[in-house]
């Protein structure tokens, strides 16, 4: 049985801001369907915590689709939440920035940063444009962010000041909505799978955010964006490890793990789903 | 001080190679990435490569990828540039330059070295 | 490769005026990634501007470069005898690393 990590969780009733879903479609992506109207709709956002707008195709699509705001926020917000899953501060790392910088298999070269392990700081890499590993940012103030040490030896967060790499600057740096858990891997992971424009029917994989797992789907050969693996490994290796918990001052968390892929389910469960 | 010394001109003949030196001194050779950067004649600057010595990381311009050798010889703090099966329009002086591992603020430059190729 | 375009090859005025340089990109570049060197005859480049507006080491504040996406500009607001040189816009945002082929900026 190939077993997975599970959270150590603690149950408190704490500062950060639950995240309240009433329903588990509320943590479905905003899904326009196949067909081609055009149809305000609304959807919950996870990673916003709100109720936001999106065009609908007019069939098909999800549960997370709503007819007005209103309806969106009676569906899947509460008030009177009052508890969360929050993990303990480590002073560590995310796991993978101790990866070596990885160029991917693409040939569109580009710059990124990495966390070089050996030097203790982010450095500039040639990226190819797809695939590689999660120590891989787009600018080198987001991998200070994730993998270099603050001053006081914790992970530099999100919230406060940070040194502009390229005058040497203070800046104040824009304030993310906290969420219980944010993604610190390439951004395509949150993408949609998206078919592209051709007619072929290739096998694919995707990675699903909501669910936190890869799953297939069919290519159709040209287009499409770059949440597209040709196996589930890759998938996993490229997009499994984005998910990093928060507290409230924007700390980094990294999860204490156990080995047992049920378990994990639940968790994640009662974070997304569970009737709060 | 940071200094990067490049070696002597050099007249080639077609189809032979060339091999450039670039000392450096006043900083760790290691921690930072040379870039060897090429200007012919009345011409624009080119990028041909970088090399980072630590783990001797290089990254190539595709165009030099065949004909161009960069290696670094960390106990002298000297960095290296090979180009092969030279032609006319590889006449140019051949800078070296040092940047940071964080952006490519080439802020220190060799002197240059000149290399004509002639028959 | 992204090629970068400087115009004009070749500008001429006189002390005191204002100059204009204009780099252009064939694909948008982060402006962060964007830097402009100075070049005099018989010497090797320095660097001169770099994150598109940050001015190096000892460049004198009558420089000043903007743009973002594919434009970039990098002006003199008052032209002194020492500004006379080449200017090379560089991207280091694709690779291969990339420079304009440079405007020659020379007294009229």
């Known amino acids: 049985d190939s077993e997975e990590d599970e959270e150590h969780t603690i149950i408190t009733d704490t500062e950060l801001p639950p995240l309240k879903l009433m329903h588990s479609f509320c943590a479905f992506k905003a899904d326009d369907g196949p067909c081609k109207a055009i149809m305000k709709r609304f959807f919950f956002n996870i990673f916003t915590r709100q109720c936001e707008e999106f065009i609908y195709g007019g069939c098909e699509g999800n549960q997370n689709r709503f007819e007005s705001l209103e309806e969106c926020k009676k569906m899947c917000t509460r008030d009177n939440a009052n508890r969360i899953i929050k993990t303990t501060l480590q002073q560590e790392k995310p796991d993978f920035c101790f990866l070596e910088e990885d160029p991917g298999i693409c040939r569109g070269y580009i710059t990124r940063y990495f966390y070089n392990n050996q030097t203790k700081q982010c450095e500039r890499f040639k990226y190819g444009g797809c695939l590689g590993n999660m120590n891989n940012f787009e600018t080198l103030e987001e991998c200070k962010n994730i993998c270099e040490d603050g001053p006081n030896g914790f992970q530099v967060d999100n919230y406060g000041t940070q040194l502009n790499a390229v005058n040497n600057s203070l800046t104040p740096q824009s304030t993310k909505v906290p969420s219980l858990f944010e993604f610190h891997g390439p951004s395509w992971c949150l993408t949609p799978a998206d078919r592209g424009l051709c007619r072929a029917n290739e096998n694919r994989f995707y990675y699903n955010s909501v669910i936190g797992k890869c799953r297939p789907f069919k290519y159709s050969g040209c287009g499409g964006n770059e949440n597209n693996f040709t196996s589930k490994q890759e998938c996993l290796r490229a997009c499994k490890k984005g998910f990093i918990q928060r507290i409230s001052k924007g700390g980094l968390i990294k999860t204490k793990r156990k080995r047992k892929k049920q378990r994990v389910k639940i968790a994640y469960e009662e974070i997304f789903v569970k009737n709060m | 001080e940071v200094q990067l010394v490049q070696s002597g001109a050099e007249l080639k003949k077609p189809g032979a190679s060339v091999k450039l030196s670039c000392k450096a001194s006043g900083y760790t050779f290691t921690s930072y990435w040379m870039h060897w950067v090429r200007q012919a004649p009345g011409q624009g600057l080119e990028w041909i490569g970088e090399?980072?010595?630590?783990?001797?990381?290089?990254n190539y311009n595709e165009k030099f990828k065949t004909r161009a050798t960069l290696t670094a010889d960390k106990s002298t703090s000297t960095a290296y540039m090979e180009l092969s099966s030279l032609r006319s329009e590889d006449t140019a002086v051949y800078y070296c330059?040092?940047?940071?591992?964080?952006?490519?603020?080439?802020?220190?430059w060799g002197q240059g070295t000149t290399v004509t190729v002639s028959s | 490769e992204i090629v970068l375009t400087q115009s004009p090859a070749t500008l001429s005025l006189s002390p005191g005026e204002r100059a204009t340089l204009s780099c252009s990109a064939s694909s948008s570049v982060s402006s962060s990634y964007l830097y402009w060197y100075q070049q005099k005859p018989g010497q090797a480049p320095r660097l001169w501007i770099s994150?598109?507006?940050i001015l190096a080491s000892g460049v004198p504040a009558r420089f000043s470069g903007s743009g973002s996406g594919t434009k970039y500009t990098l002006t003199i607001s008052s032209l002194e005898p020492e500004d006379f040189a080449v200017y090379f816009c560089?991207?280091?945002?694709?690779?291969?690393?990339?420079f304009g082929q440079g405007t020659k900026l020379e007294i009229k």
């Open positions: 560089h991207q280091w945002s694709h690779y291969p690393f990339t």
């Open positions: 994150g598109t507006s």
């Open positions: 330059a040092r940047s940071s591992v964080i952006d490519v603020a080439m802020d220190y």
């Open positions: 090399i980072k010595p630590d783990k001797g990381r290089i």
